[in-house]
Structures are given as C-alpha cells and as structure tokens.
C-alpha cells in the first residue's frame, strides 16, 4: 500500500485532524480522575488505575492494550514504626522530633494511604551525632568544606538543602565524605517564590511540606536486583548486599519548619559565603555541632523503612502501523505518584490519555499511522525508572532493531511561562517546524506561533532567532531508550521563567500538596498550557510515525558535535603543561567531527533527491536515519557506568538530571589536578578521546552511501 492508501485521509489534513481532536476540557477531566487518591507504585490503587487505563485505551480504539508486570525492589516506610529525626540532650532524651506526616491539604483530611515523607531505599538505622550543614551537598560544596574549610564530615550527620542536583548525588557525595546520615530539607530560598502564598492559598511550599524521592545511584540499571535483565518470574535476583545503587547510610527528608529547629542551633564555622545562605532566620553555620548552650545536644535519626520485592504494572498500548508495522514510535510516561501526583505525573498522564483518545478517534474513522505507535503508562518511575527500564530490558532486541523514537510524557507543566524542550539534535528541526505551526497559549502572543513566544521567552544562547533546546540528562523514563539503547528521544513541557524564579523545580514537587486543585487553581485554570503540551508531544509522535521520510536532520548533530568538541577541548586546555607532557591531542576527535559534518551534509543532499516512490530506497534511507542515534552507542558503556552507553551524552556524574556532552572525556578530566597518579589520569583522558573520536567516525560512516 502507498502511504496515502494506508492513512485514508489526505496527508495535509492528517496532522490537523489529530490536533483538532485534542481538547483542554478532556485533559482537565482526566487529570481530575487520576488525582483523587494516591497511586504509589506497588499498591493496589495503582494496579487498579493500570486496569482502568488499559480498559479506556481499548475503548479509545487501540489495537491491543496489555499489562506488563515485573517484580522489582521497592521501598516503603514501616507503618507502625515511623521515621523521624530528634534533637537529644546529654541524657539521651528527645527534646524535639521532626514531623511524622505532612498536614493534609483541605479536602483530603480523610484520604487513607498517604505515604509519609521518606527517602526511598534508605537503609534502616539510628545514627546519632553532630550536624554539619553542607549546602546543596554538591561535589563543589564538599570540596569547599573539606579542602578550603578543612571540615571533616566523617562520622557526622549532614544536613543538605534540596535543589540544584538530583538527591541521589547528594547522598552519594555525603557517603564518600564519610557521613553516617543525611537529612534533606527544602529551604524557602529554593522552594518559596517571593510574593506568592503557600498552599492552599498559592503554589508555594508550606513549612510542613516535604519532598519525597528515591536516593538511588542506579546509573541506568533499573531494578537494583536484576541489572541488565527483566525482573520476570524466572529472574535470578542478587542479594541485597550486591544490589545496584543502594545508599549505605540512613537518609530522611524534612520541611523548613523542622529544618529551622535543627539549623537555628548550629555552631562551628560560619558559612563560607552568601551562596551557602538560604532564607530561614538561622545563621547557616556549617558546624560541626550546636553552639554554646546547646553543644551537648546531638541529632539522632530513626529510620525503619524496608526494601521489598513488589509487583509493578506497565500498560502498553499498540496502534499498528499500516506501512511499516515493524518500526516503533513510542510515547511513554509514568503513572505512579508519590501521593496525588497533581503535576508529577498525572498532568503528563492526562495528556497521554487525550493523545491516545485522539489517535483512536482517527483510527475509528479508518486512518492508520504509517509506523506502529506504542503508548506506555510506566510504573515505579519514582523508584528509579523501574517500569520503563524493565520493559526495555525485556524487549531490548526488538527495540534496538525497530525503535524509531521515544517521546517522554511525564509532568506537562512545571510552570506556565514558556515551552521547554530537551531532545536529541536529530529532532531539532522537527520541533522547530512543529512549533511554528502551533498557536502560542501565552498572554501577549495571541495570534502568534508557539515558536515565536518560545523563542522570545527562552532564546538559544548560541543561535539568534531560535529557541533554547537542552541536552537530555536523566531522571525520567527516556533514560533507558536514549542512554542505553540509543533510540532518538525527546521531551517537552511548559516551564517557569528561570530568570526570575531561581527555586529548584516547582515548590510543591513530590509533596502531599501536589493536587488537582494546585493545577486547576494556580497553574493552568483553562488547561491551555496542557493542551499546548499535548499538541507538541502528540504532534511529534504523529510526524515521527507518519512522515514518509523520518523527520530527522543529521546536520544538526554535526553542529552540536563541533560545539561539544570545542567545549571539552577548552576544558582540557586549562592544563596546557600536562597536555604537552602526556602528548594529549584532540586532533582525532576534531577530524572525526569534520568527517561527520561532510558526510552528514552529503547524506542530506541525497535525502532531498532520492526516489521516494521506491520503497526499498526509502526504507534504506530511513534506516540510516533511525540507526544514526544507535551508532553513538558504545557496547562497553562508560567507565563504571555500563548502562550509560551513549558516547555523546550521559547524565552528569555530579547531577543525574543534567546532561553532559562527551561524558567519558569530561569525567576523565574532572578534578584531574587532584589525582594521585597524573600519568594514569591523563592516559585515561587519551583513551576517552580515542573512544569518542572512533565513535563519531563510525557514526559518520553509517551515513555514507551504502555501496
């Protein structure tokens, strides 16, 4: 069949028909439905929601909708033995205890099964000792403490403020510094925007609000007990001592009311500079320990959470492609939430639901996409991207041969200022072209395109007249598809104004106050931003699944490769003497990038000219585009991170959320001046340049004429 026969609607109306079917009112209705009770991974409530979504996707018209279950390691507080932190006096009496749960929001006082704030996968323990305040617990914060201030965290309980980097990196850093416990808290400087009331009167974090979250350092492994393989019925599971990424010291999160009581007594060293001060009325002394009158008091943690192998459920829906059913475009987002999930994830899940409904409507009218579209409602994302990773592990052979693209669909909003997109460079042109066709929802941009408002509010730092598009990092379900399997990936959501709002994420992230009302009252009353995100995500899926030639532009990869090579070279050039001494050269990398640029340019020319009516040649060209992302995968993975296999991008070793370019070289160069064996360290830099240069050259050759 030709693609026109397959689709049954003339091509120019396909996208419009799909987009016109998306309705803000439906997204609102779905969000309400998904947020009335908690849907914590591994619970009966989340299983029931999985079955509901399965049933509704079938009604919407998908060809098949299946549940895919796995038995993975999860973590829960002990219901009868709550977690808390105490200040104890010299007699061991508890003179202050942190809260056991968040004050429930209005209207939710009688909801059961609200999990109290906890750090998922914390080991049990009751350490006591002096407190050290470590700012954000970033790598550079510990450098400041240990190297400049000569403060030793060994045997201390550290208290760190949330923000800037993934909490798992904070815990890893604290462990490496010798701490015996970690307290995480939300400082108003990061989670309370000036001039806005706290929930329920506004979108700011109240003093009793607490951010939940996992503290794993999985590095892409998925289920900690079955790295590399699906946690199925016949899985071999590691012992807990060999599990991947588990923290070794107790960790617990608190709100700023409780943090005030701990921090107000801090003595020892003054904060090194103003960047260590938050907004509480406390001195932000670093410690160790309490001041004068309180110097005999200590802090004690009481952590009793348990790790349990628990069944989780993904929902996988299929809309079979009419022409290339063996090519998969995937739209996936998670379903599990810490509590109500008003933003994370259900603002995303509601959008996916409406996208499925719209595709289903077109299918019922006789249309089919050219390629197969897979829709996924992932489970246990909050516990380490477990549902998506286990499914990808189970289906890795199919995915690496057939995966065209993955579009992520977690939270649709983290603000209501402008669009935010992170994606592979292959998708830059797709995103630009699509947003030029969509209407902006922003005030003051009536009648203007989304591209225009986005570019105005979030301009590219490199290219004038273009919007900022960021690198993919991790911390979400695209990780396994992009970083491990090399499937072109992207994500889009509406975000805040990062210039004026410097707080981290959105204030109520992972708290009990992330409710339907938060979204409906304060973020998006008309659900117009949700609709725009549905149009962007859905539009990307539509184009990827339906365009005759895949909407990937390999020339954009060439541009960023040059930029990344320049950047890593300039980092290395901070050590000119060592580069000379150890004969470190980037020539091979720059040569490979040059070759890639030339070959990509020629490929693009051929792409314009080839006979698109020849299905064999069309398939060949499309396969070269599809497999280009795959060509950046090193089967051996990055050093000590075997599941991060993409040579161009990986999550930063210092912040899982952030993407790092040429991560192998970057990590080899990081803090190289402190390495005990410089010859070995610079040898590793050279090896990583070699790996990067080879990979770029090899990828370029996949775009060469095949014979």
């Amino acid at each position: 069949k030709s693609s026109n026969e397959a689709t049954n609607i003339t091509p120019k109306h396909n996208m419009k028909a799909f987009l016109d079917e998306l309705k803000a009112e439906n997204i609102k209705k779905f969000l309400y439905n998904f947020t009335q009770i908690p849907h914590l991974a591994g619970t009966e409530q989340n299983f029931q929601l999985a079955k509901q979504i399965q049933s509704q996707w079938k009604e919407f018209g998908l060809d098949s909708v299946e549940l895919a279950h796995y038995d993975v390691l999860l973590s829960y507080p002990n219901k009868t033995h709550p977690n808390y932190i105490s200040i104890i006096n010299e007699d061991g009496n508890e003179i202050f205890n942190t809260s056991l749960f968040e004050p429930p929001p209005p209207g939710y006082e009688n909801v059961s099964d609200i999990v109290p704030p906890f750090s998922a996968f914390s080991p049990q323990g009751m350490p006591e000792g002096d407190l050290v305040y470590v700012n954000y617990a970033r790598t550079e914060d510990f450098f400041k403490l240990e190297r400049d201030m000569k403060i030793n965290c060994s045997g201390k309980i550290v208290i760190a403020r949330y923000g800037k980097v993934f909490r798992g990196n904070k815990v890893k850093n604290a462990q490496l510094a010798g701490a015996k416990g970690v307290i995480l808290y939300s400082d108003p400087a990061d989670y309370f925007a000036p001039g806005v009331k706290s929930y329920p009167d506004g979108w700011n974090l109240p003093g009793g609000g607490v951010q939940r979250g996992n503290i794993l350092n999985l590095n892409g492994a998925g289920d900690p007990l079955t790295p590399g393989y699906p946690a199925n019925e016949y899985a071999y599971r590691r012992g807990i001592a060999e599990a991947v990424g588990l923290p070794s010291i107790p960790v617990h999160p608190i709100g700023y009311y409780d943090a005030q009581k701990l921090l107000e007594k801090m003595g020892g060293s003054a904060p090194p500079d103003s960047s260590w001060r938050g907004s509480l009325k406390v001195p932000y002394n670093v410690g160790p320990g309490f001041t004068g009158n309180f110097s005999t008091q200590k802090v004690k943690m009481h952590i009793h959470s348990t790790n349990e192998v628990t069944r989780i459920y993904n929902v996988i829906g299929t809309l079979r492609g009419a022409v290339e059913p063996d090519r998969y475009v995937i739209l996936g987002g998670h379903r599990d939430s810490w509590v109500f999930g008003g933003i994370d994830p259900q603002s995303g899940a509601a959008v996916v639901h409406e996208i499925v409904r719209s595709f289903g409507t077109l299918k019922k009218e006789g249309w089919r996409p050219r390629r197969t579209i897979l829709f996924a409602s992932w489970d246990a994302e909050e516990f380490g991207l477990l549902g998506s990773t286990e499914w990808a592990e189970e289906n890795s052979r199919l995915l690496q041969e057939r995966g065209v693209a993955y579009i992520n669909a977690d939270s649709s909003i983290e603000g209501n200022y402008t669009l935010r997109v992170d994606c592979t460079p292959l998708m830059y042109s797709l995103v630009h072209n699509l947003t030029k066709e969509l209407k902006s929802p922003d005030e003051g941009f009536e009648g203007k395109s989304l591209y225009e408002s986005w570019t105005k509010k979030s301009p590219s730092p490199e290219f004038s007249g273009m919007p900022r598009i960021s690198k993919l990092g991790s911390g979400n379900d695209f990780e396994v598809f992009f970083q491990r399997l090399g499937i072109a990936s992207g994500r889009a959501r509406y975000t805040k104004n990062w210039e004026t709002n410097k707080f981290s994420g959105y204030p109520l992230y992972h708290s009990v106050y992330e409710t339907y009302e938060l979204v409906e009252k304060f973020y998006d009353p008309m659900f117009k931003y949700h609709l725009t995100v549905a149009q962007v995500r859905g539009g990307m899926v539509f184009e990827l699944a339906n365009s005759i030639v895949l909407p990937f532009d390999c020339r954009d990869y060439a541009v960023v490769l040059r930029k990344y090579a320049d950047k890593i070279y300039s980092i290395s050039m901070k050590h000119p003497q060592e580069m000379k001494t150890y004969s470190v050269s980037f020539d091979s990398l720059f040569s490979a990038v040059k070759n890639f640029t030339e070959i990509a340019s020629k490929f693009s020319e051929r792409l314009q000219d080839f006979d698109k009516s020849n299905p064999i040649v069309l398939r060949m060209m499309n396969d070269q585009l599809m497999f280009l992302e795959r060509a950046f995968i090193d089967p051996l993975g990055l050093p000590d991170r075997p599941f991060y296999r993409h040579v161009i991008y990986a999550p930063s070793s210092h912040n899982k959320y952030a993407g790092e370019s040429f991560p192998g070289i970057y990590d080899a160069l990081f803090d190289i001046e402190s390495k005990v064996d410089p010859s070995k360290a610079w040898g590793e830099v050279k090896r990583q340049i070699y790996v990067a240069a080879f990979t770029v050259q090899a990828a370029a050759e996949t775009l060469s004429e095949v014979a």
């Epitope: 942190t98 056991l100 004050p103 429930p104 006082e109 706290s198 329920p200 003093g207 009793g208």
Partner: antibody
Framework: QVQLVESGGGVVQPGRSLRLSCAAS????????MHWVRQAPGKGLEWVAV????????YYADSVKGRFTISRDNSKNTQYLQMNSLRAEDTAVYYC????????????????WGQGTTVTVSS | DIQMTQSPSSLSASVGDRVTITCRAS??????LAWYQQKTGKVPKFLIY???TLQSGVPSRFSGGGSGTDFTLTISSLQPEDVATYYC?????????FGPGTKVDIK
C-alpha cells in the same frame, strides 16, 4: 461549627489517676496542634501540655512532667490527657484548646477553647 | 524556662480611656506572643497572635506591639464589655507559659 468538648473530669483521691478526653468537631483535627490549659479556683491560666498535629512532639509544664501524658487519636478527632499521681494542687478547670493549623503556622496561640471540665483532687 | 510577667496586676480606667498593659519575657521570644481575654466565669478568648496580629472578629480598638522581651496590649478606647482579665502567653518554646494576668475594670 468549630467545637471542643472536654469530658472525664470528676472528684478523685490524691495519688489516683484520671483520663480527660477532648472531642473535636467542625475542623480538620489532623492539621492542628492541641493544648491542655488549666485554671485553679480564683487563679490565672496555667499551660499544661501541647501535642503536635501528628503526635511527633509533646511538651509539658514542669509541674506535671512525668505524671501527665498527652496523646491524640486523629482517626477519632480526639485528644487525651492521662493524669497519674494526682495531687491537691492539680485541682482546676481543665480546658482543651486548639493550637495552630500546621499547614499555615508553626507557632500560634490557642484560638478555640472548650468549656472546660472540672477536676477535684481531694481525700 | 521562660518566665512571663505582667504589669500592672490590675487597673481601673474610665470608659473611653486608652489602656496599656505590659508583658515581659525573661528571654527573647521574637514575636511569638499571644494575648487572651477572660471574662469572669467565661472561657478565655484569643485576641492577638504574633504580638500584633488581631485575630478575626476582635474589635480594632485592641492592638499589640513589641518584640523580643517587651510587649504591650493597648485598648485605645475602653468599653464596658472590655472588663476582664488579660493574659499574655509565650509560644516561642515550651513550656508555653502564661503571664499572671492583668485585671481591668471600669472606675
């Protein structure tokens, strides 16, 4: 409407025990700190004890420490005061009072009071 | 523990007079101070929190001030229904002690 109703008062001999209850209605009990305050005949107000909204912290006046225990059951919208080793000087009207809604305040006064229940300790 | 003292212990004033009661804490309590009114035979009534914020429904002739250790409650124009004993209370740190009270009546 918002209401606190104390019960459990009465006449008791020195050294014996008594348990006071305070039933709350008309508000989200699980968000509020709760206090007990007493007033001896012809005297001023004396703060007795407080319990945090979630029971995480309990504080007592020195005069009752080790003898009285404050507790709460959020599922029953009720707070309690277990009074052991009672003394003649514990004779008073005992008021249940609502403290701060922890969703809004960490520190707050007592904005709603019950009518009080009388405890008389006498041989 | 923080001790609270009040002065005067009692006062008489005429209707329409401006009346000021002082409360002192033995150590700084920031602005974590509340004022209560108790009429004879009645339950105490919450007037002011955070030293100066009027509880809703309290007449505007009542005002509070101060911070740290020294606080005041002022009735700008004394009314017959203001005859009562007034108590200050520390709620900065436990024990949340009350002052001994100031009895206000009309001459």
């Amino acid at each position: 409407q918002v209401q606190l109703v104390e019960s459990g008062g009465g006449v008791v001999q020195p050294g014996r025990s008594l348990r006071l209850s305070c039933a709350a209605s008309g508000f989200a009990f699980s968000r509020y700190g709760m206090h007990w305050v007493r007033q001896a005949p012809g005297k001023g107000l004396e703060w007795v004890a407080v319990i945090w909204y979630d029971g995480s912290n309990k504080y007592y006046a020195d005069s009752v420490k080790g003898r009285f225990t404050i507790s709460r059951d959020n599922s029953k919208n009720t707070q309690y005061l277990q009074m052991n080793s009672l003394r003649a000087e514990d004779t008073a009207v005992y008021y249940c009072a609502r403290g701060g809604d922890f969703l809004y305040y960490y520190y707050y006064g007592m904005d709603v009071w019950g009518q009080g229940t009388t405890v008389t300790v006498s041989s | 523990d923080i001790q609270m003292t009040q002065s005067p212990s009692s006062l008489s004033a005429s209707v329409g007079d401006r009346v000021t009661i002082t409360c002192r804490a033995s150590q700084g309590i920031s602005n974590y101070l509340a004022w209560y009114q108790q009429k004879t035979g009645k339950v105490p009534k919450f007037l002011i929190y955070e030293a100066s914020t009027l509880q809703s429904g309290v007449p505007s002739r009542f005002s509070g001030g101060g911070s740290g250790t020294d606080f005041t409650l002022t009735i700008s124009s004394l009314q017959p229904e203001d005859v009562a004993t007034y108590y200050c209370q520390n709620y900065n740190s436990a024990p949340f002690t009350f002052g001994p009270g100031t009895k206000v009546d009309i001459k």
